[in-house]
């Protein structure tokens, strides 16, 4: 008799694919054309990358600095009116992506929550809740709640009132701590939180350490979903040597848990990179006119357009990469082990029940190293066979699809590869 | 122009509830939050509560055992009750616009409590 | 709660003189701080939010200063008109709570 199947995990669709951040509208869609209409526009785009969710904003009215001159409620006319909104969520919705609204506050201004003293912002937070969840949006994201006091406390309100309005609605929030402690403090209160935190770009980037922060946060979190970004708004680009940026897109999507990437990531998109541009939001390289100001300033290969048309690109390992995560069982919920590997690799298994499993072999190093993988702390049901095929390297040079021996694995300078293999009984 | 006006009985016996209605003109009801403020005579103003067109609400600990107040969209009204009046709760009773601050107030009503 | 302190319940003043009412917050406030003006009969009028920001049609001579727990209304070359009580409010916290006023008399 055949062994029989494990039963599947509840899945919300956060569980399903990447989250896509969106925090300025205008950087993301160009000189002058930044509104929700022109967003719109833009979804297919979205769909490209096969995200899940958007998360936009704020897009509220806000002053900087000024309590009297925020609305949470109101839109900022100069991103639209509430009936452009309206009409993107309908779109969003027919393209199968989700939309969560930012609701920082003071997001304009030095202090995002104004100040640790004030809570009168905090206090009308859970009306804008109310009201956004009766517009249709699918989840909310606030940053930086170590500036908000009793954030604990105020979380715990809000996930209330969006899961008491469908448990398919998501609460993001966002803090500048890498401290897991904290984190785990603020995890605590909120059984479905997702959190964006500094946490993983707290490393000397080697595959010891970035290792042993993954397990030790896996580890502190237990079996609670979690998120995997480097910070809780910015570039990869902000955090990450060039040269790393294939790789973290790699581990990101195949670890357990949502990846939450930010606009400009899939492409490598610098932080201040062209003169003239904002550090926080660069503005989108679409093609070589997104920066009429310079001539000759934006290169092809920096660009959507150029990456698109090259299948070596990030931008195509960004969409090889999505694609795998939102539909292989193993990677979408699957169990998680490392194992022992060479000094400077970082690598691990996922697999579920018996569908075909994935292995994850990510070198950190400078220079080019045998794998020695060693599957002895591995639990047999995750035992590794002599050979895997190739899904994917984060380098060129590799046959896709070709069978690799694992015993003789060797890997290049920086280089990632995603295997898989068959489940045998 | 947003303009705003209180209606209800002048006169409540102790012990009864105090009822109020204010309706909005000149702008929607909708997206805004709508409060209650109170000054007895010869002292200053009471903050009563606020509540936002979904029903959500926001009342004063000091009064929240008392106090109900409800929003009829439809109508653009909103409402306060407050049970268990005492000679105490006399006063000029107003309805604003609350943006933190108060932009837009009602002419106010006064409302005594006495058998 | 925050208690807004206005501690002279009355100010005299002349026609043309400039003159100053003050509150005071019991706990830190930020510039979370509004100032109204009440006449009698009549309901309470906006004249400063943001502790400095003048509401809009609120004559210049009226100008608000301060942050933190210390608030000023000044009113510059007072005019007849402005004989009324003036009370601050703070929003930085629910419940949101006023000063009890300050009653502006002309000499």
């Known amino acids: 008799r055949a062994p029989r199947c494990r039963e599947l995990p509840a899945q919300k669709w956060w569980h399903t694919g990447a989250l896509y951040r969106i925090g300025d509208l205008q950087a993301f869609q160009g000189h002058g054309s930044g509104n929700l209409a022109g967003l719109k526009g833009r979804l297919d785009y979205l769909s490209s990358l096969k995200v899940k969710g958007l998360v936009l904003g704020p897009l509220h009215k806000n002053q900087k600095d000024d309590v009297a001159q925020t609305d949470l409620l109101q839109i900022d006319p100069n991103f639209g009116s509430k009936e452009d909104f309206d009409n993107l969520l309908q779109s969003a919705k027919k393209k199968s992506i989700r939309v969560i609204l930012d609701l920082t506050p003071n997001y304009r201004g030095e202090n995002l929550w104004f100040s640790t003293q004030v809570d009168s912002v905090a206090t009308k937070v859970k009306d804008a809740l109310e009201f956004w969840l009766q517009a249709g949006v699918d989840g909310f994201q606030v940053r930086d709640i170590e500036n908000l006091k009793d954030a604990s406390s105020f979380l715990a309100e809000w996930e209330n009132i969006t899961k008491g309005f469908s448990e398919d609605r998501l609460l993001i929030a966002g803090t500048n701590s890498s401290d897991l402690q904290q984190i785990v403090s603020l995890l605590e209160s909120n059984k479905d939180l997702l959190l964006t935190s500094s946490y993983l770009s707290d490393s000397s980037f080697t595959g010891e350490h970035t290792k042993s922060l993954v397990t030790q946060y896996l580890n502190a979190t237990g079996n609670r979903w979690c998120s995997w970004s480097l910070s809780q708004a910015g570039l990869l680009t902000s955090f990450l040597p060039a040269q790393l940026l294939r790789l973290y897109q790699l581990m990101l999507f195949t670890l357990p848990g949502t990846p939450v990437f930010s606009y400009g990531d899939e492409i490598g998109l610098k932080a201040a990179a062209l003169p003239g541009q904002p550090v926080e939001a660069p503005v989108m390289l679409w093609d070589e006119s997104s920066f009429p100001d310079i001539p000759g300033a934006v290169s092809a290969n920096m660009t959507v357009k150029g990456q698109s048309e090259d299948p070596g690109s990030l931008l195509s390992l960004f969409r090889q990469l999505s694609d795998q995560r939102s539909k292989e069982r193993s990677l979408l919920h699957g169990d998680f082990h490392t194992f022992s590997s060479g000094p400077g690799l970082f690598s691990y298994i996922r697999h579920w029940d018996q569908n075909e499993r994935f292995l994850v072999v990510l070198n950190f190093g400078d220079v080019g190293l045998s794998a020695g993988l060693q599957a002895s702390d591995l639990p047999a049901s995750a035992s590794l066979p002599t050979k895997a095929d190739l899904v994917l390297s984060t380098q060129p040079g590799r046959e896709e699809g070709s069978p690799l021996e694992l015993e003789r694995l060797k890997l290049e300078p920086h280089e990632g590869l995603l295997l898989r293999f068959p489940y045998v009984a | 122009q947003v303009q705003l006006q209180e209606s209800g009985p002048g006169l409540v016996k102790p012990s009864e509830t105090l009822s109020l209605t204010c309706t909005v003109s000149g702008g929607s009801i909708s997206s805004s939050y709508w409060s209650w403020i109170r000054q007895p005579p010869g002292k200053g103003l009471e903050w009563i509560g606020y509540?936002?067109?979904?029903?959500?609400?926001n009342y004063n600990p000091s009064l929240k055992s008392r106090v109900t107040i409800s929003v009829d969209t439809s109508k653009n009204q909103f409402s306060l009750k407050l049970s268990s009046v005492t000679a105490a709760d006399t006063a000029v009773y107003y309805c604003?616009?609350?943006?933190?601050?108060?932009?837009?107030w009602g002419q106010g009503t006064l409302v005594t409590v006495s058998s | 709660d925050i208690v807004m302190t206005q501690s002279q319940k009355f100010m005299s003043t002349s026609v043309g003189d400039r003159v100053s009412v003050t509150c005071k917050a019991s706990q830190n406030v930020g510039i979370n701080v509004a100032w109204y003006q009440k006449k009698p009969g009549q309901p309470p009028k906006a004249l400063i939010y943001?502790?400095?920001y003048r509401y809009s049609g609120v004559p210049d001579r009226f100008t608000g200063s301060g942050s933190g727990t210390d608030f000023t209304l000044t009113i510059s070359n007072v005019q007849s008109e402005d004989l009324a009580e003036y009370f601050c409010?703070?929003?930085?916290?629910?419940?949101?709570?006023f000063g009890s006023g300050t009653k502006l008399e002309i000499k």
């Open positions: 943001s502790a400095a």
């Open positions: 509540i936002y067109n979904s029903g959500s609400t």
């Open positions: 409010q703070q929003y930085n916290s629910y419940p949101l709570t």
């Open positions: 604003a616009r609350e943006t933190y601050y108060f932009d837009y």
